[in-house]
Interface confidence: medium
Amino acid sequence: EVTLLDSRSVQGELGWIASPLEGGWEEVSIMDEKNTPIRTYQVCNVMEPSQNNWLRTDWITREGAQRVYIEIKFTLRDCNSLPGVMGTCKETFNLYYYESDNDKERFIRENQFVKIDTIAADESFTQVDIGDRIMKLNTEIRDVGPLSKKGFYLAFQDVGACIALVSVRVFYKKA
């Protein structure tokens, strides 16, 4: 496997593009059991109707790979566990990609993105100790291809869930 992006290995802030700029996805630092900061993206507008919050990664070079794999580690909160929520709470989010030769696209243009899948929390999860809490971590892997341009962007669309993206890893498999 060759890793093209690993959010856990980025030093400092990830600085991905969020739309809207405020009130949607927010970059939040949490501490793991070794007191190492983990950069996460979180959103939890479960009572607000008609949510459409986008988060886009930086440009990811494909390094000639035709097919890439996207591994997402996340927590997704059960709507039933949230006090006082109405019918606006969702339990999924959407994963998109957009191929581009331009590594400096500044804005999210939703209509350029192609949907990969709707992501939901699986019954299976791993537990990770983060000091005073146990983190229930879901892992989902999706693949996309064939790719033809120099690189691509990934995007995450929230439609009203309570989510924390803890890790995003993109890789390809050597022949």
């Epitope: 927010e26 996460t40 939890c44 109707p49 909160r77 006090p83 983060i130 809490r133 146990i134 983190m135």
Partner: nanobody, 121 residues
Framework: QVQLQESGGGPVRAGESLRLSCTAS????????MGWFRQAPGKERELVAV???????NYADSVKGRFTISRDDAKNTVYLQMNSLKPVDTAVYYC???????????????WGQGTQVTVSS
């Protein structure tokens, strides 16, 4: 870590008013749903009112028309204006913020320590 501190509770007579305040320290809460819950002796904690970042509100049927929730994000404060209070409103009132922090169960939620409201007839 967000911490919440309520104030404004106390003893009142039926028909009178109180305004509860809840101030957050730590991360600003302008992007979060804030709420007030209450717990009467021997009863479960129940929703009183919540307000979303966009200002949408939701009230328990028992307080509609009497209570008003509002927020001042510049002051990191959420308010509960309680008018026409009744003895059945007697309870400990808790401030609450829903955070998307990772964890399990109630570790997603931050609660204040509560403020007592006692309404006598």
């Amino acid at each position: 870590q967000v911490q919440l501190q309520e104030s404004g509770g106390g003893p009142v007579r039926a028909g009178e008013s109180l305004r509860l305040s809840c101030t957050a320290s730590g991360r600003a809460f302008s992007t979060y749903t804030m709420g007030w819950f209450r717990q009467a002796p021997g009863k479960e904690r129940e929703l009183v009112a919540v307000i979303t970042p966009g200002g949408n509100t939701n009230y328990a049927d028992s307080v509609k028309g009497r209570f008003t929730i509002s927020r001042d994000d510049a002051k990191n404060t959420v308010y509960l204006q309680m008018n026409s209070l009744k003895p059945v409103d007697t309870a400990v009132y808790y401030c609450h913020v829903v955070l998307a922090v990772v964890g399990t169960g109630n570790e997603y939620d931050v609660w204040g320590q509560g403020t007592q409201v006692t309404v006598s007839s």
